[in-house]
Interface confidence: low
């Protein structure tokens, strides 16, 4: 019996087609993805093949103005229109709190939403009961397939699930659910979830009875043969893991941002064992036409977005200096504003010992693309912020050793004075440079804000200590020459859309007046 699994993950609000790098579509003839194009391909496969499942491995929420404005209603509407069969909860589904998940998505979705390792307690337990499930059995042709869900147990550090949801260890939580499915005579089981490729492989290895793992969170691109675009494969598609009980378990993921549709064909024997698996992600490029009815619907929903981008989010009473002449050479107040917003967006008081789990921010000055003039009645709009942060990136959480941070700050000024983008803006960090010293030895003082303290204060950076830092995904991926971050990071979790972080902060503060306050000094 053959099953076709179509899958997406980490779509992050890319409802419209995007450019090749998943930013805003500029030249339509070269754009990719989007739900209208995805629908065309899904329908084509549904017509051609008998047993098809369309699955999503989480993180539909967060990433563009679509989510900012519609807050998840757009996800439910268009996933319903595409007739998804199931979705796993990702960490970003909790970005607007549990209410922001329940009302727009859980109550509106016409497909099961899954996670076996999230347990509700207290008053929330009854409120959320039945709105998401640990697993779902789906009839496919003449057979049944069990789908069991999972979500990153780091979600409390990455999003806003509140105190009434407990995120358990994935493997511990999945095993009894799979065992339960087995008792229901379900012998074809897919683990669908959002914990990253390393955890996906562990689940394939450790959870008895899981036949296939469909993952997300790490934006992993797998491909067999010559890849069709710029993404470099992390391995073959599917990635085969040998389980502890000797089975070959295919593991798949489909990069991110709706650029690809994962396409996996599985052949099962009559006992539900996987005989063969093959496939590849399908690049959703302009050779695939956008479905006209979905496209028309997108255009209808779009109108509200255009109105939103010119509305006032808040006010500034000072000039927000985002000029290259400032932000690539010295501390600039736009850099301070953005870093303050990044830290504010990551306030998670999860432990009495720590006032917060993270206190530090770094931001490449080259990522700040425009100032904002206060003389326009102080008004700040989404449109203004889009000029400052035009690349559609995210502000991510990483864990780094102090020694890596020191290298990053040396890199920040290794060729100082050439108006290059790697000069770092900061938050929760005091750095002093001596430019008379040779490159690689210019950081003379580097103090960081403590987290394990009731009164935050600045202490010297310790080389062997592991620190959490918020930074742009561009830096986490080694951009602007920050190879040491990419090579040495100990953990990397994708965060919220950059503009959304800053706009939320400005809306919250109402009036802002960031200063240049001595975070970066030259001796």
């Amino acid at each position: 019996w053959e099953l076709t699994i179509l899958h997406t993950n980490d779509v992050h609000s890319r409802l419209e087609q995007t450019s090749e790098d998943s930013s805003k579509c500029v030249n339509a003839s070269r754009c990719m993805g989007g739900v209208a194009r995805l629908f065309t391909k899904v329908q084509q496969i549904r017509r051609a093949e008998p047993n098809v499942l369309l699955l999503d491995a989480g993180d539909q929420y967060q990433g563009t103005i679509w989510f900012t404005v519609y807050k998840g209603a757009e996800v439910a509407h268009f996933m319903n229109a595409l007739r998804y069969d199931a979705m796993a909860l990702g960490n970003h589904e909790f970005d607007n709190g549990v209410e922001g998940l329940i009302e727009p998505l859980l109550k509106e979705a016409k497909f099961p939403i899954l996670s076996a390792n999230i347990k509700a307690k207290g008053p929330l337990a009854s409120q959320i009961s039945g709105l998401y499930l640990p697993y779902k059995v789906l009839p496919v042709g003449d057979e049944v397939v069990g789908i069991v869900g999972y979500t990153s147990k780091e979600t409390p550090f990455l999003s806003n699930p509140g105190t009434n949801l407990v995120f358990e260890d994935e493997i511990t939580a999945l095993q009894p659910e799979v065992d339960k499915l087995k008792t229901l005579n379900v012998n074809k089981i897919i683990a669908l979830g959002h914990s990253g490729f390393e955890m996906d492989k562990l689940i394939a290895q450790k959870v008895r009875g899981v036949d296939v793992v469909v993952g997300g969170h790490s934006n992993t691109f797998l491909y067999t043969g010559n890849p069709p675009s710029k993404e470099v494969p992390a391995g073959k598609y599917p990635f085969i893991v040998t389980s502890d009980d000797g089975r070959k378990v295919p593991v798949v993921q489909a990069y991110a941002f709706g650029k690809y549709l994962g396409y996996l064909k599985i052949e099962f024997d009559e006992r539900g064992n996987v005989i063969s698996s093959h496939g590849n992600p399908i690049l959703l490029n302009s050779s695939i036409p956008e479905d006209p009815s979905i496209k028309a619907d997108i255009n209808k929903w779009r109108i509200k977005l255009d109105n939103y981008s010119t509305q006032e989010l808040g006010k500034t009473i000072v000039y927000l200096d985002g000029s290259s002449q400032s932000c690539r050479f010295r501390e600039c107040n736009m850099g301070n504003l953005i870093c303050d917003a990044m830290i504010n967006n990551n306030l998670r008081h999860t432990d009495e010992m720590f006032w917060n789990h993270v206190s530090m921010c770094i931001l490449n000055g080259g990522g700040i693309r425009s100032p904002i003039d206060e003389r326009n009645n102080g008004t700040i709009t989404w449109e203004n912020l889009a000029a400052v942060l035009p690349f559609g990136g995210t502000f991510d959480l990483v864990q780094l050793k102090g020694s890596t941070l020191k290298k990053a700050f040396e890199h920040s000024v290794h060729r100082y004075g050439q108006s290059t983008g790697e000069f770092l803006q900061v938050g929760g960090i005091h750095v002093v440079y001596d430019l008379s010293r040779k490159p690689g030895d210019r950081v003379v003082k580097l103090d960081v804000l403590c987290t394990k303290c009731r009164v935050p204060s600045y202490d010297p950076l310790k080389m062997d200590e592991v620190y959490k830092v918020i930074l742009p995904n561009f830096l986490a991926n080694g951009g602007d020459g920050f190879q040491m971050i990419k090579d040495e990071l100990l953990r990397h979790d994708s965060g919220d859309q950059d503009i959304n972080v800053v706009s939320t902060y400005i809306s919250k503060m109402k009036v802002i007046y960031p200063a240049v306050e001595g975070r970066i000094k030259f001796s």
Partner: antibody
Framework: QAYLQQSGAALVRPGASVKMSCKSS????????IHWVKQTPRQGLEWIGA????????SYNQKFKGKATLTVDKSSNTAYMQLSSLTSEDSAVYFC????????????WGQGTTLTVSS | DIQMTQSSSSFSVSLGDRVTLSCKAS??????LAWYQQKPGNAPRLLIS???SLETGVPSRFSGSGSGKDYTLSITSLQTEDVATYYC?????????FGGGNKLEIN
């Protein structure tokens, strides 16, 4: 489509100065750098410097500081390069080229201005 | 300054050949590398930026690769119109510098 039109060939005496022009069209002049590049058979292609018309910011190759002076006239979308105290070593083809402010590769080039310094 | 070295200034090639041109930087340039084609009497023409990104209108027989200090331009099947001089250029550190060029000549 961007287009860069350079001034015609020049024959000048040693010790004199020359000012060549590069008129841009087909794009927003103030949002890209104008770079100047020297080409000789002996030295190949050498970057002289760049000017950003948006704010007048100039960066020079140290080798050409004192030799080349870059200016722009935003009203006519024209960039200029003046070369002073000319010697036979300055005989070359000089190109202007457009480049992004951050990523300085040159996507559109002028046709070149041939400068001959001879008595 | 970063030196860009293109080994051997001229190549004797045949039409239909696969041609590989190399370019070595004196230090790491973090993939900030462009390739240009220049024909006699003309300005250089940008072929590739960012090591691998083909400019619009550049035939797909051209491709770029490399990282760190070592980069390559490949032409899969040389056509008459490809006979030209090819230059690499780094745009990582000011002053931006070019290689000495590789001149392709038909043998």
């Amino acid at each position: 489509q961007a287009y860069l039109q350079q001034s015609g060939a020049a024959l000048v005496r040693p010790g004199a100065s020359v000012k060549m022009s590069c008129k841009s069209s087909g794009y927003t002049f103030t949002t890209y750098n104008i770079h100047w590049v020297k080409q000789t058979p002996r030295q190949g292609l050498e970057w002289i410097g760049a000017i950003f018309p948006g704010n007048g910011h100039i960066s020079y190759n140290q080798k050409f500081k004192g030799k080349a002076t870059l200016t722009v006239d935003k009203s006519s979308n024209t960039a200029y390069m003046q070369l002073s105290s000319l010697t036979s070593e300055d005989s070359a083809v000089y190109f202007c080229a457009r480049g992004d402010y951050d990523e300085s590769y040159f996507d559109y080039w002028g046709q070149g201005t041939t400068l001959t310094v001879s008595s | 300054d970063i030196q860009m070295t293109q080994s051997s200034s001229s190549f004797s090639v045949s039409l239909g050949d696969r041609v590989t041109l190399s370019c070595k930087a004196s230090e790491g340039i973090y993939n900030r590398l462009a390739w240009y084609q220049q024909k006699p009497g003309n300005a250089p023409r940008l072929l590739i930026s960012g090591v691998i990104s083909l400019e619009t209108g550049v035939p797909s027989r051209f491709s770029g690769s490399g990282s760190g200090k070592d980069y390559t331009l490949s032409i899969t099947s040389l056509q008459t119109e490809d006979v030209a001089t090819y230059y690499c250029q780094q745009y990582w550190s000011i002053p931006w510098t070019f290689g000495g060029g590789n001149k392709l000549e038909i043998n």
